[in-house]
Amino acid sequence: MKVLQEPACVSDYMSISTCEWKMGGPTNCSAELRLLYQLVFQSSETHTCVPENNGGVGCVCHLLMDDVVSMDNYTLDLWAGQQLLWKGSFKPSEHVKPRAPGNLTVHTNVSDTVLLTWSNPYPPDNYLYNDLTYAVNIWSENDPAYSRIHNVTYLKPTLRIPASTLKSGISYRARVRAWAQHYNTTWSEWSPSTKWYNSYREPFEQR
């Protein structure tokens, strides 16, 4: 049994780090493998993560962690029974992937405007809370050619779009993702998408 692609880990800068790797052949990850992790810190204990399958040869492990601070460094040991397959380390503050925004809602009852709101995935005491910027993807199921990305570089998790910039009488979908510039993060996963019908019609004199 051998590792084809070494574990790569990302932290949500809150309480979970996710490690993914690929094995040399089909593996029952939860039955055959264990990922042991330990914070390099006085009197810390070794903790065990039971991986799940992620495709035929892929494994994924969700490591429970404390709040992240820049000094934190973890040792990682991947075991198959008594056999050590891989040994490495992981500094969560240097590999951050934010949590996806949630509760994406579309408000169409605002005159001439489509208002999108969503929730910041972090509590106010988390360092990422005031550092997130967002990308909102809007596309149409009726018009495959229409797909736009709106960059939201201000802190408020809202986006206003003039309803007149969207075609009337067709459905649109939106989703949002986040990243934190000062922490050099990757983009989060996209939020679940939400759908709405654009019923806005221009006033008669503008037609």
Partner: antibody, heavy 125, light 112 residues
Amino acid sequence: EVQLVESGGGLEQPGGSLRLSCAGSGFTFRTYAMTWVRQAPGKGLEWVSSISGSGDNTYYADSVKGRFTISRDNSKNTLYLQMNSLRAEDTAVYYCAKDRVSITIRPRYYGLDVWGQGTTVTVSS
Amino acid sequence: DIVMTQSPLSLPVTPGEPASISCTSSQSLLYSIGYNYVDWYLQKSGQSPQLLIYLGNKRASGVPDRFSGSGSGTDFTLKISRVEAEDVGFYYCMQALGSPYTFGQGTKLEIK
């Protein structure tokens, strides 16, 4: 009441051995790291050794490494310090102390907040 | 190893007057914001040490509020706002960032 009680001290010849014990009560012993600190006559405090709550991780001062062994029996709520190859400079009062909560991912530290009464070790021929 | 240097080593104080003890470490004891791994202990004559302050500025349970700790990184201070006769003894700073834990030399506080 949270309490630590040491025992096992005494007079021993150079090169001899002693085993110190520290019985804990009033707290969940297995969740805490534990530490030994000593004080030579008329001197200051010197850290000797520490052990994590599970007993898997141990730490030693250079002055005792290879001669002293720290261990614990969580079923008996007891900490031990096995002292071999004793030297005159090991003469001191030995204290055990309750250290950090080590079962959390990042151990939680509240100082060495409970100390035993101390047990005296004298190494002399 | 981290070296802890205390000053003064002797501190005669008049009851009711303030007292201050300084402790300097050879490297930073700041692990994360608000978490400086330095403690202060008092050892009264013939007794075991007792914890006064942990993590730089957090008062241990049952410690009178006339004791306070401050500082960050490498420079730390223990202050007693009004010294009482029962405060006499040896005061030690200790770093607990990692092993080996190291203590300062101790400061002997005595009443004038």
